[in-house]
Every structure is written in structure tokens, then in C-alpha cells.
């Protein structure tokens, strides 16, 4: 779980000729507000498809009245960030739509009128926890400058917000292989329970034994990049075997369609398929009415028979916002006790409890580790009402008192031989395989999208797994 944050820096005329007319006038003062819609992945989706990652609406900006004869300046902006909470993993790649709306404050019958001034869209890669990313997008003669970032909500950490933190069981340090949880330095990363071998960088899980891939990665353990090396055709995807994408030159390169329109090639040129509310050769003309379906999530549109009159969205249960774009956050009721993480699954609320607590609302305190000692540097792990020791490398058993054979679990795949080593284990791979655990086949034609052997290491050489 986490939050995507968007900071609008400026909205005004773009560089070059053809400055846009000011959206407000002395007769019709107005103010701006913004809407952001997020979708996971890099796929081209229609503008009206659901904002599966979430959506948010800004506050209204200050009232602005055009000064007669003056060019349209950067318009006054609403205060604060736009925040889009996400409850699942951050996907790493995402599509966004940012809309600039005008609220006219003249003497309209029935209250203020809204109209869409500009819509920009794009696709980006972004790791959670990283710095603010800056961007500039143009829509017709308008230019929007903004920054964005994704951050995890405690106790989630990591680039996908899928690793969890838990309180330290020992005051001085975290257990073997577990790092302190920045910025919660008094907590430690909880050990991952994903499918054995699932890539910690490119895979994630929400259930024990799962391995689900972030966009751009594939394979059962999410270790294979979605690559272009094995594509068969010179243009377009050959995803049946590799999931790869090859962009090629063509009239749709750079997408000449504005406002989230999708481009398709024609024998002579290109054709834009425009999202609702836009039309024109390049989807550059806008004007939203009830006929354009501005209400999301099944909201009922009332009024707004023409672009200059207002419409109102009546939202179904569970949604709110002027366009029904916001899901009601039932987790704001804070049902989970003792620092439990609330998950709104749509059909039910669930609490993911911190270590040491259990029950549907994390109301039961389990003091499993009190008075328990794990030998040889092991760490006591609470859970399920029975203490368990997470043992340091080379030790095993209930209290970490037994010497462990690192090869007992047969970690070397594809017939590789395992050798115990003072710093861990070493796999000697069978011919045709390589990798720390012999997990990668060596394709003789060199067309594999898998990582090559490190320099100086031949397939079949023993590889140390630390």
C-alpha cells in the first residue's frame, strides 16, 4: 500500500505562437482544478477505461479574472498535492491522465459550470520511494508543469511497496539478512514469503508462495526481462513466445493524437480514435456534456445538455467526488488495531496484522518471544501463538542449536551438484545450465533473454551463492 503524489507547478500558455485565449474573463471569472487518473502498466488504454490504480481531484484554485488586453499568464493553482492512494503493490510502470478543469463562476442558473480545458496523458516507469520526477506536457497551446512520486505507507517498504516492516525483536540489530526499515529505523524488514527464487527486485507476492511480476518482467520467477532480443518480426510484437515489443518507424510514432487519443496507421497517413469528449483530426477539440459520459464508476449524469451548461454526477454507493472518481476510503474508519495494515478488498475489509498480533482486527496480543532465546545469533519471530527462530546461516533446528547442511534443501536446479562452503553453498552446474543456482539454461544460439554468465565464469563452473 502507498500513495502516488502529484504536484502541479504551473499551467499556462506554452511557448511558441498561437497563445491561447484566457479561460476566464471579467464577465466570467473562473478558477481551475485538476483531476488525475492512474492505470497500471504501459498499455495504451482508452481515456474512459477505469482508473484501476486510482484517481484524485484537487481543491479549487483561487478565483481568476482576466486583465483586459493582457496575454494569458500562468493561471493561479490550487494549494496542495493530489494524492492517489493505492492498496496493492505499486506496479513500477503506470499510465496517467491529468485533466485541467475550469469552473466558471458567473451568474449561471443552477450553479457553476465546468468545462475541460486540457488533458495530457503519458506512460512512465517509477519506483516507489524514489525522488520527485519532473515533467512537462503540452495539450494544444497549453503547457502543464508537474512533479510526481510514489511512496509507501508504513509498514510497507521497497520499490513496489510489497515488503513489510515489523518491530525489532532484539534491541540492537535486525536478524540475519534483514535490513532496518528506513525511515522506521527501530523496525526491521519482515522476511519475504514469496515463491522460492522469486526475484526480489522484479517480483512480488501478497500470499505465501506467490510470484507475480512487475511490468517489464516475465517468467515463473520474474527473472526474465520482457526483451526485444528474440522478436521474430522486424516491427510489432511477437509476444506469443517472448512477450517482447519492438517499436518501429511509422506515422504513429510519437503519437500525434492529443488528449489520450489512440493512433492507427492508414495507407496514406494516420487516424486518431479520440476518447469521449474530444474530437478533431488530432483529438484537439474538447467540450464535455452528459453525452460524453463524464461520470465514472456508474455515476448518473444530470443536466449539461450542451458544453456551456453544468452537469452533476450522482455517485453510486462507495464512490464520491464531482465525477465519482474517488472510491470512498473505508479504511479511514481505522478498523485495524495495534498498527495493523487495513486492506479494502472491495467486498470486505481485511487487517494485515503486525508481528505479535492476531485476530480479525489485530486485537489479540501474542507475546510469543517473551523469555525465548535463539542460539547462535538466531532471531525470534512471533506469529501464530508459537515462537519460531529465524536462524543465522549454517544453523538450524527449533532453537538454532543444530549445525545445518546448506545443501539439504537441494538448492541447485537442473541436476547441479551442491557443495557446502564456509560462506554458504556452491552449485556446480550440469552442462547447459548456469547461474548461482543453475537456474538459467545456456542457449547455444545465444538468443536467450536471460542474463549471461558473469565475466570469467563459464557455464558449468561452480557458482557461489551467498
Amino acid at each position: 500500500a502507498g500513495v502516488f503524489e502529484l504536484q502541479i507547478h504551473s499551467f499556462g500558455p506554452g511557448p511558441g505562437p498561437g497563445a491561447p485565449r484566457s479561460p476566464c474573463s471579467a464577465r466570467l471569472p473562473c478558477r481551475l482544478f485538476f483531476r488525475v487518473c492512474l492505470k497500471p502498466g504501459l498499455s495504451e488504454e482508452a481515456a474512459e477505461s477505469p482508473c484501476a490504480l486510482g484517481a484524485a481531484l484537487s481543491a479549487r484554485g483561487p478565483v481568476y479574472t482576466e486583465q483586459p488586453g493582457a496575454p494569458a499568464p500562468d493561471l493561479p493553482l490550487p494549494d496542495g498535492l493530489l494524492q492517489v492512494p493505492f492498496r496493492d503493490a505499486w506496479p513500477g510502470t503506470f499510465s496517467f491522465i491529468i485533466e485541467t478543469w475550469r469552473e466558471e463562476l458567473g451568474d449561471q442558473i443552477g450553479g457553476p459550470a465546468w468545462s475541460l480545458l486540457a488533458r495530457v496523458a503519458g506512460r512512465r516507469r517509477l519506483a516507489a520511494g524514489g525522488p520527485w520526477a519532473r515533467d512537462i506536457q503540452r495539450a494544444g497551446a497549453w503547457e502543464l508543469r508537474f512533479s510526481y512520486r510514489a511512496r509507501c505507507e508504513p509498514p510497507a517498504v521497497g520499490t513496489a511497496c510489497t515488503r513489510l516492516c515489523r518491530p525489532r525483536s532484539a534491541p540492537s540489530r535486525c536478524g540475519p539478512g534483514l535490513r532496518p526499515c528506513a525511515p522506521l529505523e527501530d523496525e526491521c524488514e519482515a522476511p519475504l514469503v514469496c515463491r522460492a527464487g522469486c526475484s526480489p527486485e522484479h517480483g512480488f507476492c501478497e500470499q505465501p508462495g506467490e510470484c507475480r511480476c512487475l511490468e517489464g518482467w516475465t517468467g515463473p520467477l520474474c527473472t526474465v526481462p520482457v526483451s526485444t532480443s528474440s522478436c521474430l518480426s522486424p516491427r510489432g510484437p511477437s509476444s506469443a513466445t517472448t512477450g517482447c515489443l519492438v517499436p518501429g518507424p511509422g506515422p504513429c510514432d510519437g503519437n500525434p493524437c492529443a488528449n489520450g487519443g489512440s493512433c492507427s496507421e492508414t495507407p496514406r497517413s494516420f487516424e486518431c480514435t479520440c476518447p469521449r469528449g474530444f474530437y478533431g483530426l488530432r483529438c484537439e477539440v474538447s467540450g464535455v456534456t452528459c453525452a460524453d459520459g463524464p461520470c465514472f464508476n456508474g455515476g448518473l449524469c444530470v443536466g449539461g445538455a450542451d458544453p456551456d451548461s453544468a452537469y452533476i454526477c450522482h455517485c453510486p454507493p462507495g464512490f464520491q467526488g464531482s465525477n465519482c472518481e474517488k472510491r470512498v476510503d473505508r479504511c479511514s474508519l481505522q478498523p485495524c488495531r495495534n498498527g495493523g495494515l487495513c486492506l479494502d478488498l472491495g467486498h470486505a475489509l481485511r487487517c494485515r496484522c503486525r508481528a505479535g498480533f492476531a485476530g480479525p482486527r489485530c486485537e489479540h496480543d501474542l507475546d510469543d518471544c517473551a523469555g525465548r532465546a535463539c542460539a547462535n545469533g538466531g532471531t525470534c519471530v512471533e506469529g501464530g501463538g508459537a515462537h519460531r527462530c529465524s536462524c543465522a546461516l549454517g544453523f538450524g533446528g527449533r532453537d538454532c542449536r543444530e549445525r545445518a547442511d546448506p545443501c539439504a534443501a537441494r538448492p541447485c536446479a537442473h541436476g547441479g551438484r551442491c557443495y557446502a562452503h564456509f560462506s554458504g553453498l556452491v552449485c556446480a552446474c550440469a552442462p547447459g545450465y548456469m547461474g548461482a543456482r543453475c537456474e538459467f539454461p545456456v542457449h547455444p544460439d545465444g538468443a536467450s533473454a536471460l542474463p549471461a554468465a558473469p565475466p570469467g565464469l563459464r557455464p558449468g563452473d561452480p557458482q557461489r551463492y551467498l
Epitope: G209, C211, R212, A413, H414
Partner: antibody, heavy 113, light 112 residues
Framework: SLEESGGRLVTPGTPLTLTCTAS????????MIWVRQAPGKGLEWIGI?????STYYASWAKGRFTISRTSTTVDLKATSLTTEDTATYFC???????????WGPGTLVTVSS | DVVMTQTPSSVSAAVGGTVTINCQSS????????LAWYQQKPGQPPKLLIY???TLASGVPSRFKGSGSGTQFTLTISDLECDDAATYYC????????????FGGGTEVVVK
């Protein structure tokens, strides 16, 4: 839950699209497979769209079937059906490639002249 | 192409007894352990029993046990109950040019 739709009686050579619709969760971060079962026969794997968006197909299904995904649906498009394609078609959700724990009830496709 | 052979095709045992189903693959499954077992009853979709060769799926009783690695796998059902009468399938994950799954031919379990 998952539910397949689009199954019907068609004539040979007809294209057909089956849709798997999810309720209660988003499909974007799960592996989704299509499997079929001819009457009185065993399960036959058609293909998968993994959580990263890549698609893979059984060797016999390449070129005959296409899988695509949105956040709430996964489609299986058949280009040209034959009588051997008569079967119940299932979609299933998995968190890993070898554990598909949520299945739809299936939709019956009958190909007959 | 990979061939997954399930034996026997049909097995009968009494309530309280034990049955063993074998699944043999013509090539090693991915990572030696990407193998799952499913139970299917007439008119119903399959139900996941075991994944990762030996890990019990949520809500599945411990009477079901999976074992094996590489190309040879076994599903053992002990303390048979009438409700266990069904067809059981193994499913392997393999690596080729891309990735793919394959199912075994199925084993019908009859409980007397």
C-alpha cells in the same frame, strides 16, 4: 470470483471471443490462464497472460488463440474454430505459475456444422 | 513437446484407505518443483490442492500430500473419504523458447 462468458454454438471457421470477468479484485497483478476441457476428456492448457503483461501459448494454440487483458477482464480470441475446439473453456487466476487457486465455472463452446 | 504421464488412469480404494497417484514428465519441470495438483468433480472447475510440488494450498486438509522433484512426482491421499472421489490432475510449468504449462491426463479416484 471469476466468470467466463461468450460461449455459444458456432459453425466451423467462425471467430469467437470469450471473456473472463473478475469481481472483487483487479486482474492486473495476477497470472491468468485459459484452460479447456472437451466433453469427457482431460484439461488442456491454452495460454497465459502473466502479471507483467506477457503472453505465452501452448504450441498447438499459437496463431489460433490470442489472450488480452484489462484490469477487470481477460479475453480469449479464437480466429477460426473447428469441431475439435468444442469444449468447456475455463479461466483461472494464480499468484504463481504453478498454483491457480481461483477458477471460473466455465463456458461451453460448441462448434458444429 | 513435453509429455506428462499420469498413472494409473483409474484407482479404487475403500474409505479410510490410501491412494497414490504418479505423475511423470518427459522433461524436468521449471526449477525442479513447479508442479501443482488439482482435484476436479463432474460439472465443476478444478480445485487447487498442492503447488510447488509439496505445498498444501489454503484450506486443503493435510491428508493430501505431494512429493517429488524434477520429472517424478506423487500425490498421496490418506484416510480416504467419500468426498475425495474425483479426477486428479498434475500440472507442470516448463521453459522452452518462452514458458508454458501442461496437464497430465488425469486419474479417476473411486472411493468404495
Amino acid at each position: 470470483s471469476l466468470e467466463e462468458s461468450g460461449g455459444r454454438l458456432v459453425t466451423p471457421g467462425t471467430p469467437l471471443t470469450l471473456t473472463c470477468t473478475a469481481s472483487g479484485f483487479s486482474l492486473n497483478t495476477y497470472h491468468m490462464i485459459w484452460v479447456r476441457q472437451a466433453p469427457g476428456k482431460g484439461l488442456e492448457w491454452i495460454g497465459i497472460v502473466d502479471s507483467g503483461g506477457s503472453t505465452y501459448y501452448a504450441s498447438w494454440a499459437k496463431g489460433r488463440f490470442t489472450i488480452s487483458r484489462t484490469s477487470t477482464t481477460v479475453d480469449l480470441k479464437a480466429t477460426s474454430l473447428t469441431t475439435e475446439d468444442t469444449a468447456t473453456y475455463f479461466c483461472a487466476r494464480g499468484g504463481s505459475w504453478d498454483g491457480f487457486n481461483i477458477w471460473g465455472p466455465g463456458t461451453l463452446v460448441t462448434v458444429s456444422s | 513437446d513435453v509429455v506428462m504421464t499420469q498413472t494409473p488412469s483409474s484407482v479404487s480404494a475403500a474409505v479410510g484407505g490410501t491412494v497414490t497417484i504418479n505423475c511423470q514428465s518427459s522433461q524436468s519441470v521449471y526449477n525442479s518443483d513447479f508442479l501443482a495438483w488439482y482435484q476436479q468433480k463432474p460439472g465443476q472447475p478444478p480445485k487447487l490442492l498442492i503447488y510447488a510440488a509439496s505445498t498444501l494450498a489454503s484450506g486443503v486438509p493435510s491428508r493430501f500430500k505431494g512429493s517429488g522433484s524434477g520429472t517424478q512426482f506423487t500425490l498421496t491421499i490418506s484416510d480416504l473419504e467419500c468426498d475425495d472421489a474425483a479426477t486428479y490432475y498434475c500440472q507442470g510449468t516448463y521453459e522452452d523458447v518462452g514458458w508454458f504449462n501442461d496437464f497430465g491426463g488425469g486419474t479417476e479416484v473411486v472411493v468404495k
